[in-house]
Interface confidence: low
Amino acid sequence: KSSNEATNITPKHNMKAFLDELKAENIKKFLYNFTQIPHLAGTEQNFQLAKQIQSQWKEFGLDSVELAHYDVLLSYPNKTHPNYISIINEDGNEIFNTSLFEPPPPGYENVSDIVPPFSAFSPQGMPEGDLVYVNYARTEDFFKLERDMKINCSGKIVIARYGKVFRGNKVKNAQLAGAKGVILYSDPADYFAPGVKSYPDGWNLPGGGVQRGNILNLNGAGDPLTPGYPANEYAYRRGIAEAVGLPSIPVHPIGYYDAQKLLEKMGGSAPPDSSWRGSLKVPYNVGPGFTGNFSTQKVKMHIHSTNEVTRIYNVIGTLRGAVEPDRYVILGGHRDSWVFGGIDPQSGAAVVHEIVRSFGTLKKEGWRPRRTILFASWDAEEFGLLGSTEWAEENSRLLQERGVAYINADSSIEGNYTLRVDCTPLMYSLVHNLTKELKSPDEGFEGKSLYESWTKKSPSPEFSGMPRISKLGSGNDFEVFFQRLGIASGRARYTKNWETNKFSGYPLYHSVYETYELVEKFYDPMFKYHLTVAQVRGGMVFELANSIVLPFDCRDYAVVLRKYADKIYSISMKHPQEMKTYSVSFDSLFSAVKNFTEIASKFSERLQDFDKSNPIVLRMMNDQLMFLERAFIDPLGLPDRPFYRHVIYAPSSHNKYAGESFPGIYDALFDIESKVDPSKAWGEVKRQIYVAAFTVQAAAETLSEVA
């Protein structure tokens, strides 16, 4: 059968039919349904939601919907022995204690099983000592403290404000600095937007609100006890001492009311500059310890959380492809939440649900996609991307041979200003073309395309007339597919105006106040931004699964490779003397990029001209496109990060959320001037240039004519 016969409707009509079937009212209804009680990973409530979604996806018309379960390490507070932080006087008496829970939002006062704020996977402990304020606890903050201010964090409890970087990196940095405990808090400077009221009267964080979250440094490992392999019934589990990524010091999060009580007494050094000051009426002194009057008082942490092997459940739905059933396009997002999940994840899960419903409607009318579409509702994302990673580990052989693309679907909104897209360069043209076909939901852009409003509000820093598309980092379920397996990946959501809102993420992130009402009252009352995100995510999946030639443009990879090579070269050129001394050359990398550019250009010409009615040639060309992302995978992985195997992109070693280009070279160059053995350090730079150049050249050759 030709592809058009198989899919039964003309391709243009298919896409329009699919998009027209998506309804804002349904997304709203699904969001309400998913947010009435907490769905914490490993709980009965989340298992019940998994079964509900399985049942509804079957009703919607998918060919099969299965639960895939794993037994992974999770972390919970002790219900009878709560976590808190005290100020103690010289007699050891607790003269101040932090709150044990967040005041519940209106209408939720009688909801049970709201997990109190905690840092997942914190070890137990009751350290006491002087406090040191470490700003955001970034690498550069500790450099400032230790190198410039000569402040030693060894044996101290550090207090860090949330924001800028992933919390796990903060904890790792504190550990490396010798701290014996970490207090994380939300400063109003980062989580309280000026001119907006606190929840429930607005979308700002109240003083008693607290951000939950895991503090692991997994580096893509998945379940800490079974790195590289699925946590199935016959798994061999590591002992807790050998588990991957667990923190070694107690950690606990607090809100800004409680933070004020700790910070207002701080003495010692003044903050080094204004970038260390938040918005509380406290001096932001660095410490160590409290001021004169309070100098005998100490801070004591009381952490009693436990790590437990617990069963989690993914829901995997299949819509079999009519022509290429062995080619998989995956749409996945998580289901587990810290509490109600009003934004994270259920604003995403509701969109996935509506996308499944629309695809199911088309299928019931006799249509099938060209390629197989897999839909996933992941569990335990909040505990370290565990559900997606375990499933990918279990199915890695299939995925690396058959995986065309992965589209992520966590939170659909983090604001209501404009679109935000992070994806592989292979998808740039797909995203551009799709957004030109969609209507903008933005006020002032009636009748204009989404591409137009997006480009106006978020212009590309390099190319005029084009929108910004960012690198993929991590901190979400695409990680295993992209960074480990090399499957082309992308994500899209509506975001805030980064120019005017300098706070980190959205204020109520991972708090009890992330409710349905937050979304319905303040972010998207008409659910028009949710609908737009559904159209973008669903449209990408539709095109990836249905277009005859895969909608990947390898020339866009060539463009960014040159940009990344220029960037890393300029970083290295900050050390011209050492480059000369150790004969460091980037010639091989620039040569490989040039070759890639030429070969990609020739491949694109052949792609225009080949006989698309010849199924063998069509499959061959599509396979070259599908396997291009795979060609950037180094089977040995990055140094000390074996599950980050993509040579062009990896999560930053200093911030899991951010993507870094040529990460092997970047990390080898980072802080190289402080290395004790410069010869060895520059040798590693040269090795990383070699690995990168080889990989780019090898990837280029996969696009060459096959014989």
């Epitope: 204690n97 932090t98 005041p103 209106p106 109003p188 429930p200 109240p206 009311y257 004020q260």
Partner: nanobody
Framework: QVQLVESGGGVVQPGRSLRLSCAAS????????MGWVRQAPGKEREFVAA????????LVSDSVKGRFTISRDNSKNTLYLQMNSLRAEDTAVYYC???????????????????WGQGTQVTVSS
Amino acid sequence: QVQLVESGGGVVQPGRSLRLSCAASGRTFGIYVMGWVRQAPGKEREFVAAIEWSGSNRLVSDSVKGRFTISRDNSKNTLYLQMNSLRAEDTAVYYCAASNRLYGRTWYDFNESDYWGQGTQVTVSS
């Protein structure tokens, strides 16, 4: 809005006890701290005691320390002040106050922007 209604005041002999109650109604969500402030005839308002919503932090003024205890029943949205060993100088109108304390304020400071009850008279006299 939040409504606060005090009860339990009265005339009592020195050395005896009284228990004041303050029932909160209306939009009580977001109330972070509740407390008692008193005003004796011809004098300024004086802070007596305060408690955070979680009950984890309480503060009692030095003038009543060891004699007065503040507590709160969240399920009933009620604040209590147990006053033992009463003295003549405890005679005053006792006001219940509640605050959703914006950041940057000392937690037990009550001011005009907070919620106040009408007050209940306590007279200690032989």
